[in-house]
């Protein structure tokens, strides 16, 4: 139920990558506005994105307070000219989101190979440790600091002259691999959270190759 000139939000969807978290919904408003509330299972509701005509709301600031908590959001619909108006039950029309646990569900962003350095028949490949919006003691944590050994990187590498790939893994951000002297290699990495059952893997990083313009070592 609700007022005749408002419709409830629907298709409430969490879009989250490396903890940057936005709630999206439908429909595009016609003569109505929205306000979003978010809470943990045991917490109080906090209002965000007041009386907006957007159909998304950035809730990152709230979820990064504790990424292991489970959050619920709801979207209230109000008539555009009369935000005090309520539905027939005496409160505004609203719709609940699915529950969302950032630590378990945020998508892993595409990783980046920061550098590679060859010494003899060894190559050290370093994956950039991306900074997240999760804070601790006033400083932003990196992805590795948030996930610890729960985050693994898989390296794919192959000779530029051949199609046969090899793989290695690390629960740090560095690989040390054996290569054939005088051969150029290409590299790509993928992030994985082994303990998850969904959203376990990132997309592959861009491919980086030895002997190309970027050089053997990049900051």
């Amino acid at each position: 139920s609700g007022t005749t000139n408002t419709v409830a939000a629907y298709n409430l969807t969490w879009k989250s990558t490396n903890f940057k978290t936005i709630l999206e919904w439908e429909p595009k408003p016609v003569n109505q506005v929205y306000t979003v509330q978010i809470s943990t299972k045991s917490g109080d509701w906090k209002s965000k994105c007041f009386y907006t005509t957007d159909t998304e709301c950035d809730l990152t600031d709230e979820i990064v307070k504790d990424v292991k908590q489970t959050y619920l959001a709801r979207v209230f619909s109000y008539p555009a000219g009369n935000v005090e108006s309520t539905g027939s039950a005496g409160e505004p029309l609203y719709e609940n989101s699915p529950e969302f646990t950032p630590y378990l569900e945020t998508n892993l962003g595409q990783p980046t190979i920061q550098s590679f350095e060859q010494v003899g028949t060894k190559v050290n490949v370093t994956v950039e440790d991306e900074r997240t919006l999760v804070r601790k003691n006033g400083t932003f944590l990196t992805l590795r600091q948030v996930f610890g050994k729960d985050l693994i990187y898989t390296l794919y590498y192959w000779k530029s002259s051949s199609s046969g790939k090899k793989t290695a893994k690390t629960n740090t951000n560095e690989f040390l691999i054996d290569v054939d002297k005088g051969e150029n290699y290409c590299f790509s990495v993928q992030a994985v959270i082994p303990s998850r059952t969904v959203n376990r893997k990132s997309t592959d990083s861009p491919v980086e190759c030895m002997g190309q313009e970027k050089g053997e070592f990049r900051e």
């Epitope: 790939k165 994985v192 303990s195 969904v198 376990r200 893997k201 997309t203 592959d204």
Partner: antibody
């Protein structure tokens, strides 16, 4: 619950081909790395290779590269092992396994392949 | 490629005995080592992962230790149901390699 069921094994003549299937249920194969492992009669376990079904990346033990091909059909949640130019020494039980990146947590029951004239 | 040397290849022990199996890698595998138990006609079953972590539902008499190139699997008190073949597996880099296996029998 998670289950892997291999099929397609049997008796095949040397030089011929065979395609094994591994049907997964209880999870999406594209969320995991998937492997093939074999075991010859009375022998140890031997790793063949892996696939990331999400992007098609495949890695093989060099001894199987070129003769064996791993593929996946995500819409059917099924893994495949195409084996060409089969030899008597390829006689083995072939297993598929799911990899969570720290360990192979689920294995199929295995499908036997006999290469004999 | 990384070679895994597992020993002994067979082992006979009595119920209640402490049993130890070792795997030596040809280079540092950074604890990416698992131990599996296989009974005849069955698929392998995970016992230990990341060298020292006990898999879910596995009895605490099984344990693993080691780092670098040297790894050990221990059954603190052998039980009749532990009769099986045990394999180590390195999965730090491809090609992944299994040890040759240790067949455990009860005297």
């Amino acid at each position: 619950q998670v289950q892997l069921v291999e099929s397609g094994g049997g008796v095949v003549q040397p030089g011929r081909s065979l395609r094994l299937s591994c049907k997964a249920s209880g999870f999406n194969i594209k969320d995991y790395y998937m492997h093939w492992v074999r075991q010859a009669p009375g022998k140890g376990l031997e790793w063949i290779g892996l696939i990331d079904p999400e992007n098609g990346n495949t890695i093989y033990d060099p001894k199987f590269q070129g003769r064996f091909t791993i593929s996946a059909d995500n819409s059917k949640n099924t893994l495949f092992l195409q084996m060409d130019s089969l030899r008597p020494e390829d006689t083995a039980v072939y297993y598929c396994a799911r990899d969570n990146s720290y360990y192979f947590d689920y294995w199929g029951q295995g499908t036997p392949v006999t290469v004999s004239s | 490629d990384i070679q895994m040397t597992q020993s002994p290849s067979s082992l006979s022990a009595s119920v209640g005995d402490r049993v130890t199996i070792t795997c030596k890698a040809s280079q540092d595998i950074r604890k990416y080592l698992n131990w599996y138990q296989q009974k005849p006609g069955k698929a392998p079953k995970l016992l230990i992962y990341y060298a020292t972590s006990l898999a879910d539902g596995v009895p605490s008499r099984f344990s693993g230790s080691g780092s670098g190139t040297d790894y050990t699997f221990t059954i603190s008190s052998l039980q009749p149901e532990d009769i099986a073949t045990y394999y180590c597996l390195q999965h730090g880099e491809s090609p992944y390699t299994f040890g040759q296996g240790t067949k455990l029998e009860i005297t």
